[in-house]
Amino acid sequence: ECVTQLLKDTCFEGGDITTVFTPSAKYCQVVCTYHPRCLLFTFTAESPSEDPTRWFTCVLKDSVTETLPRVNRTAAISGYSFKQCSHQISACNKDIYVDLDMKGINYNSSVAKSAQECQERCTDDVHCHFFTYATRQFPSLEHRNICLLKHTQTGTPTRITKLDKVVSGFSLKSCALSNLACIRDIFPNTVFADSNIDSVMAPDAFVCGRICTHHPGCLFFTFFSQEWPKESQRNLCLLKTSESGLPSTRIKKSKALSGFSLQSCRHSIPVFCHSSFYHDTDFLGEELDIVAAKSHEACQKLCTNAVRCQFFTYTPAQASCNEGKGKCYLKLSSNGSPTKILHGRGGISGYTLRLCKMDNECTTKIKPRIVGGTASVRGEWPWQVTLHTTSPTQRHLCGGSIIGNQWILTAAHCFYGVESPKILRVYSGILNQSEIKEDTSFFGVQEIIIHDQYKMAESGYDIALLKLETTVNYTDSQRPICLPSKGDRNVIYTDCWVTGWGYRKLRDKIQNTLQKAKIPLVTNEECQKRYRGHKITHKMICAGYREGGKDACKGDSGGPLSCKHNEVWHLVGITSWGEGCAQRERPGVYTNVVEYVDWILEKTQAV
């Protein structure tokens, strides 16, 4: 079961896997959760009764029974990993640790005005795992305001010691705050010839890329497919790094694929969740259990529900054998990957889906959409909400998008004359406005957060957040959309849709059924030509057909401009303004969401 609370002055006996150093018990719990085998941990806090060399040790533990004997020990804090829990998990750690020096390889030293600037530098440096910053009160004059960027093999400090007037913290790459490029391409027939930091077995290049992403030292990878000439290297995933952060040499080799860590895209692409099935493929590893199962899907469920199971192989039943049930082999290994992958034996293999909760919910695949037609179908745009006002009467006011379980992203101009959040109601999972009756459940709005630089839609900053009074339970009909990664600024989106219940022509009324229109993006230069009287800034993005005919209109404001990229939908724009609706050579102007990711995260992650 899920146990989240920490056990003070308690030590778990035995079951040690490895020891790492973490600045707090809370972070030790996160490290345990992300470790492929750790189920329990014991952290040692600083205490006069403890040997200082044991302070900040985080001992990761495993147990077949999922628990271990407890022993009383002062300064020890123990707990369980979140693997056993169903809630969303994040490795994002914004805490700053005062008077702690987190040791690692100091590979970069520079002057910084503040710890925050040092943390930003670490976040935007490809190698940096954590940093230590000497404050202006630091005794040694020449070290004051020095920002040390550090990395280690594990991503965690090699030691942590007390040191007055310094602060330490972690890179915020896992908080989606990095400006580093997000390169999603996988390059066929390519080998990156740089040093290997690790190697694992993977069934395909996508899994290899995802493993590279959550490996602390991996910056890029090379994968040898099952057709690779050298048999011993087939399905081998080589995790690589280089001093520059980029591959130094690319060699053309057939049947090899290479790519980059997705650490700068991890909030908008699944990196932990390997949901595919691999047919005629056997995964080898330590056997946990063998159970009868009706199908490979049922076998995956069994693996997902067994906390120690990492991957599985299902062998279908021989005709009329065992009531048509096949054998489901639940397996694990030291690193979470198969020790060997074999083909041609008839097995169907895959991974636990337990790790999917470590990915952002927004990366979940949604049902295929109906192409053509202007009316949407249920569940097609599950992040779209209708925002109603109750003044003067209840009615649709604006669109909006679910971006978190308590957060709606919309346009600031929607709130002109709205003097209180209490008069607003957010309805999710709605296709037709006529579904909304007096007794239809809604989310009350606790707070309206309007960008403080907003004046009017045409001058930009047309963005607002609604904090809901209660949390949204994600279902097929209501779930979040991913924010674009800052590293995706240069992506050219080609599959963009605007949705809403707004007017279909300038003098019209709110539509009953959610409408959709596929609209091409227009460059800001082109857009500026169409709006000579306005300043089209980089914080705006435009979309529309030259000949007009399809566009957002009154009532669509605040709703999403959703673009599909690498099978994941991203909230690229917020419907903001335009001259008329669907007019020739008058594209719609949208708030360019990627430019506000920091603002969104600052507001939504505020304590």
């Epitope: 003067p392 209840q394 209180s420 209490k422 003098r507």
Partner: antibody, heavy 117, light 107 residues
Framework: QVQLVQSGSELKKPGASVKLSCKAS????????MHWVKQAHGQGLEWIGN????????NYDEKFRTRATLTADTSTSTAYMHLSSLTSEDSAVYYC??????????WGQGTSVTVSS | NIVMTQSPSSLSASVGDRVTITCKAS??????VSWFQQKPGQAPKLLIY???NRYTGVPDRFTGSGSATDFTLTISSLQAEDVADYHC?????????FGQGTKLEIK
Amino acid sequence: QVQLVQSGSELKKPGASVKLSCKASGYTFTRYWMHWVKQAHGQGLEWIGNIYPDSDSTNYDEKFRTRATLTADTSTSTAYMHLSSLTSEDSAVYYCTRMGFYAMDYWGQGTSVTVSS
Amino acid sequence: NIVMTQSPSSLSASVGDRVTITCKASENVVTYVSWFQQKPGQAPKLLIYGASNRYTGVPDRFTGSGSATDFTLTISSLQAEDVADYHCGQSYSYPLTFGQGTKLEIK
């Protein structure tokens, strides 16, 4: 069932003030706008203003803005209208009415106010 | 302010007659129009909301129609109990406004 019960008739002198009450029951008082409407004898309906009890947000017709004050007591589910500087023009029946999902769906029985010297 | 002009101000019809009352808005109010019935000495009662939706319990001889600026209340077959004042009102924007009312009598 939803009910709006208004206070009894009032006889006031010109220049005086009056405070009318409207007690709501049978629904969540804080979740609906309460409106006040005036009807002079033999005349049509005239909107005065509204209040949202959960936030005390109010709107008024310009004509009544300086003299009418709408308040709500959520602990007793009662809405109030205070009308000051009364003149004979204010002699009328005053209704409180709940703005339901799309319209004014429930009305109080009305309070008759007579302003006479 | 949006002005709602109601006509006629009074009308007399026989039981079984088809009766039509109109309301014209000075600007587009989409379909945010309601119709109320008020019998002597009573508070108004909601008949029609959203221009054409019959309120719970209202007999189906009452029909509302229209959008934008022109709205109609129709009583398909007048009954004796329909003698009352009828008011239209817009709730599209503040201040809310009503028509002057129509007095309906039986011949």
